[in-house]
């Protein structure tokens, strides 16, 4: 049942004579495992035996038995699916039908594959893509139905004879569809390459050429183009002739139309191979090229640069940059047309030569307000010199220079003057816009060259002020010098450090914070009369009538200050005692007598003691002794004595004198 | 005599937007550079911003704490000087006093509450 | 937080001297003038010393002001009980570029 087997295999194969064929082959016998397999060369059908007759190159039989004569061809399949095979090495006899006989357990089949031996190895095939264009990459592919595991082959690839640098990609095919060897090359042909001869050699393992395949490429390129120019180097002076020449070195397909281009851009009926300029000028110095084009494209010959000398023209002056701030650089820089290049400059600064500047450029390495100003030039070159142009003005800008602060007022400036000071300046760019003045108050506010201050203040010592442009510049801060009074008088004791007593040395010295002008004089008062003008006022013994309430006053040019009144405390003991009797010191008996203990002391008597004419004192310690009813034994002479902190001091006696009443005597 | 009077002060939600005015009287205003300062409940006074005269350059400038959310214009032909408060915060909220630098005058003052 | 420094509270009984001080740095106090400025319950601020120790017309010279390096100080003597205020000092700031104020110092008259 012939449905019940399926081979698959390349059907036909190539190989040459001592080379080897593989042959890859599957098949499917549905009935079960192979028990039997020829290999015919060239089979034919015999009828009368209906059997097959040719020779065979390959058996085997159940009994696996292989006659040793078969080791040429192998069979490397199974009994079930694989039915690859191997002829090495093969014969140029080999060439015909290969019949494979197969045999199972109950079926039979005879699958035939075609072998094709040549004598020599036969050439590989170069494939090309229908249109090869110049600098487009393209694939060359080198294919030979050739491949055998038993023996190694190569693809090298040849331009003109001479191997190819570009790396080529060699794949192998050894399946049931296909056997080849390709190799790829991928290749950006130039228009140089459009004729050349590519070669792909076949070659044995060792490198031994086998054999080959070529092409002629046809590379599709624009005109490949010369320009040739009289004079050769294209330099020539205004009213000189000028030729120009395009030959096509090259073009594939043959080009259409010509064209001459000066700086890119086409000339007007300008369509044959030679340009010629006749009595040229400055304004057609350019880069010239001619242009021919193909179907392909335009091509284009180097560019001629064509010169046409002439002397310098009238400069103009760039500079980078103005306005210009003081300190930095500035680049000047003369600009001139001219051809050949101006080999020398003249540099002029408000129209004098500037000695020493022949170059293109003028650098300034730190700018001070005197390089302000015009700047002019003049370019030289072989052919003249050329015209001083209009020039090109440099503002340098700074900070105002030489701020000063100027104080406006007579001097000296006296507390609560009101003052006027100036700010002012030598020179600024760009003009002063405002002024700043410090001690700033509290809510800047803008400010004139001028500044008032009213009611100056007796410590407004220093005044700055600040021009400003763009940028502010200080002035050194000015004294006001302000001239006042001396101030915070006052009398401050030196001795003693503790209180004041009698006899004691007392030292009060007249304090001031300060005085401008610091000349002072000083004045010591006590009740208006005028005790003493040094600093200090001294007293070697204090006596109680020196208390009292003193000032001192300090003066100087601006004015006078007085101290607060300051009052001298003089401790001392009591002192000046008497005893005063009161109604009298004669009181007739039964009446009220009173004693007063009376005295100078400081701090006041705290303590009084009395004293009979018995020195008996007597139990009464306040300042009054009052006797009432006055009897004739109290009759007689009294002191008393005053105590304070400082001491004690008694009086002298006094002498109370009590008599009879007139009862008294009437009863005697 | 010199008065200053503030107004447009009121209640405004957290992110909302308040414009207060000053019209000034009794001097050049056009010559005088004019401030804000203002005055958080119970708190201490503080500089908002101010904007000089249009001859000193008519710019304006700003306290850190406000700086991109305010703006001080001014209209010289109507004396006045305006605070545009945008984004506001509740920490905005105070008493907002315009002063004239040159004679430190201050107006009395109007309320926003954030 | 206030550029300048002053305390809190200050007080002191009628007839009495009280004093209020203000600290500040080189950018504002030790290079520019002190103001003082009194502020009434409910009431804007009002200039009390300008230029360190200058007084605007209507001031009482009861009030005074003094300065030293970077500090300052208002003397008020014989205090009075409408001197019971809010007392800010301010300075130009020149690292700020605008002006700058103290906390306050509340001044209660015993």
């Known amino acids: 049942d012939s449905s019940k087997w399926v081979f698959e295999h390349p059907e036909t194969l190539y190989a040459w004579e001592g080379a080897c064929v593989w042959i890859p082959c599957t098949y499917r016998a549905l009935d079960g495992d192979l028990e039997s397999f020829i290999l015919f060369h060239n089979p034919e059908y015999n009828k009368n035996t209906s059997k097959f007759d040719g020779t065979r190159l390959y058996e085997s039989t159940k009994d696996g038995k292989v006659p040793s004569e078969q080791k040429r061809v192998q069979f490397l399949g199974d009994k079930n699916k694989n039915c690859t095979l191997s002829i090495h090495p093969v014969h140029l006899n080999d060439s015909g039908q290969l019949g494979l006989r197969m045999e199972s357990k109950t079926e039979k089949w005879m699958e035939r594959i075609h072998l094709n031996v040549s004598e020599r190895p036969f050439p590989p095939h170069i494939q090309l893509p229908p249109e090869i264009q110049e600098s487009q990459e393209v694939t060359l592919t080198c294919l030979l139905n050739f491949s055998c595991y038993g023996y190694p082959i190569q693809l090298q690839w040849l331009l003109e004879g001479v191997p190819m640098r570009q790396a080529a990609v060699t794949s192998t095919s050894l399946t049931i569809k296909s056997v080849f060897t390709r190799s790829e090359l991928k290749f950006s042909p130039q228009w140089s390459h459009h004729g050349k001869i590519v070669t792909c050699q076949l070659q044995d393992a060792d490198g031994k050429f086998l054999s080959n395949d070529t092409v002629q490429l046809n590379v599709k390129h624009t005109p490949k183009l010369e320009i040739k120019v009289t004079p050769s180097d294209a330099i020539v002076r205004e009213g000189d002739s000028v030729t120009m020449t395009c030959e096509v070195s090259s073009s594939n397909p043959e080009y259409t139309t010509v064209s001459w281009l000066k700086d890119g851009t086409s000339l007007k009926k300008q369509n044959t191979f030679t340009l010629n300029l006749r009595e040229v000028t400055k304004d057609q110095s350019g880069k010239y090229c001619c242009q021919v084009s193909n179907d392909v494209g335009p091509g284009r010959s180097e560019e001629v640069f064509l010169q046409v000398q002439y002397a310098p023209e009238p400069s103009t002056v760039q500079i980078l940059h103005s306005p210009a701030v003081e300190g930095s650089q500035v680049e000047f820089l003369c600009m001139s047309l001219a051809n050949p290049l101006p080999t020398n400059y003249t540099w002029y600064h408000n129209g004098k030569e500037m000695q020493g500047r022949t170059e293109e450029k003028v650098h300034i390495p730190k700018i001070l307000p005197w390089h302000a100003g015009t700047y002019s030039c003049v370019a030289e070159n072989i052919l003249g010199t050329g015209q001083r142009g209009p020039g090109a003005e440099l503002d340098v800008q700074y900070p105002p220079k030489k701020v000063t602060t100027v104080i406006q007022n007579p001097m000296p400036i006296r507390e609560g003057d009101t003052v006027t000071l100036s700010c002012n300046y030598n020179s600024s760019n760009p003009s002063v816009t405002r002024y700043e003045w410090k001690p700033h108050g509290a809510w800047e506010e803008p400010s004139l060259g001028v500044l008032k201050i009213q009611n100056v203040g007796w410590d407004n010592t220093t005044i700055a002020c600040a021009a400003c442009n763009s940028w502010c510049s200080w002035a050194s801060p000015v004294a006001l010098n302000v001239q006042y009074a001396p101030r915070d008088v006052r009398v401050r004791k030196i001795k003693p450090l503790s209180e004041i007593h009698s006899g004691n040395s007392v030292s009060l010295q007249c304090d001031f914070s300060s005085s401008h002008p610091k000349e002072v004089q000083f004045f010591w008062e006590k009740n208006g009369r005028l005790l003493g003008k040094e600093s200090q006022l001294n007293f070697d013994s204090i006596s109680p009538e020196d208390a009292g309430s003193y000032s001192c006053w300090v003066n100087n040019s601006i004015g006078q200050t007085a101290s607060k009144a300051w009052t001298l405390e003089v401790l001392y003991a009591p002192r000046r005692l008497r005893v005063s009797m009161s109604p009298g010191d004669q009181v007739m008996e039964g009446k009220s007598a009173t004693l007063t203990c009376e005295s100078d002391a400081n701090p006041p008597v705290s303590h009084y003691t009395w004293f009979d004419w018995n020195n008996q004192s007597l139990p009464y310690h306040s300042q009054k002794l009052r006797l009432e009813p006055v009897k004739v034994q109290h009759s007689g002479a009294y002191w008393c004595q005053g105590t304070n902190s400082v001491g004690k001091g008694r009086s002298p006696l006094s002498t109370l004198t009590v008599y009879y009443s007139p009862e008294t005597i009437g009863r005697r | 005599e010199v008065q200053l009077v503030e107004s447009g002060g009121g209640l405004v939600k957290p992110g909302g937007s308040l414009r207060l005015s000053c019209v000034a009287s009794g001097f050049t205003f056009s010559n005088a550079w004019m401030n804000w300062v203002r005055q958080a409940p119970g708190k201490g006074l503080e500089w908002v911003g101010r904007i000089k005269s249009k001859t000193d350059g008519g710019t304006a400038d700003y306290a850190a704490p406000v700086k991109g959310r305010f703006t001080i214009s001014r209209d010289d032909s109507k004396n006045t000087m305006y605070l545009q408060m945008n984004s506001l915060k509740t920490e905005d909220t105070g008493v907002y006093y315009c002063?004239?630098?040159?004679?430190?005058?201050w107006g009395q003052g109007t309320t926003v509450t954030v | 937080s206030y550029v300048l420094t002053q305390p809190p509270s200050a007080s002191g009984t009628p007839g009495q001297r009280v004093t209020i001080s203000c600290s500040g740095s080189s950018s504002n106090i030790g290079s520019n003038y002190v103001y003082w400025y009194q502020q009434l319950p409910g009431t804007a601020p009002k200039l009390l010393i300008y230029r360190n120790n200058q007084r605007p017309s209507g001031v009482p010279d009861r009030f005074s002001g003094s300065k030293s390096g970077t500090s300052a100080s208002l003397a008020i003597s014989g205090l009075r009980s409408e001197d019971e205020a809010d007392y800010y000092c301010a300075a130009w700031d020149d690292s700020l570029s605008g002006p700058v104020f103290g906390g306050g110092t509340k001044l209660t008259v015993l």
């Open positions: 002063i004239t630098g040159a004679t430190d005058v």
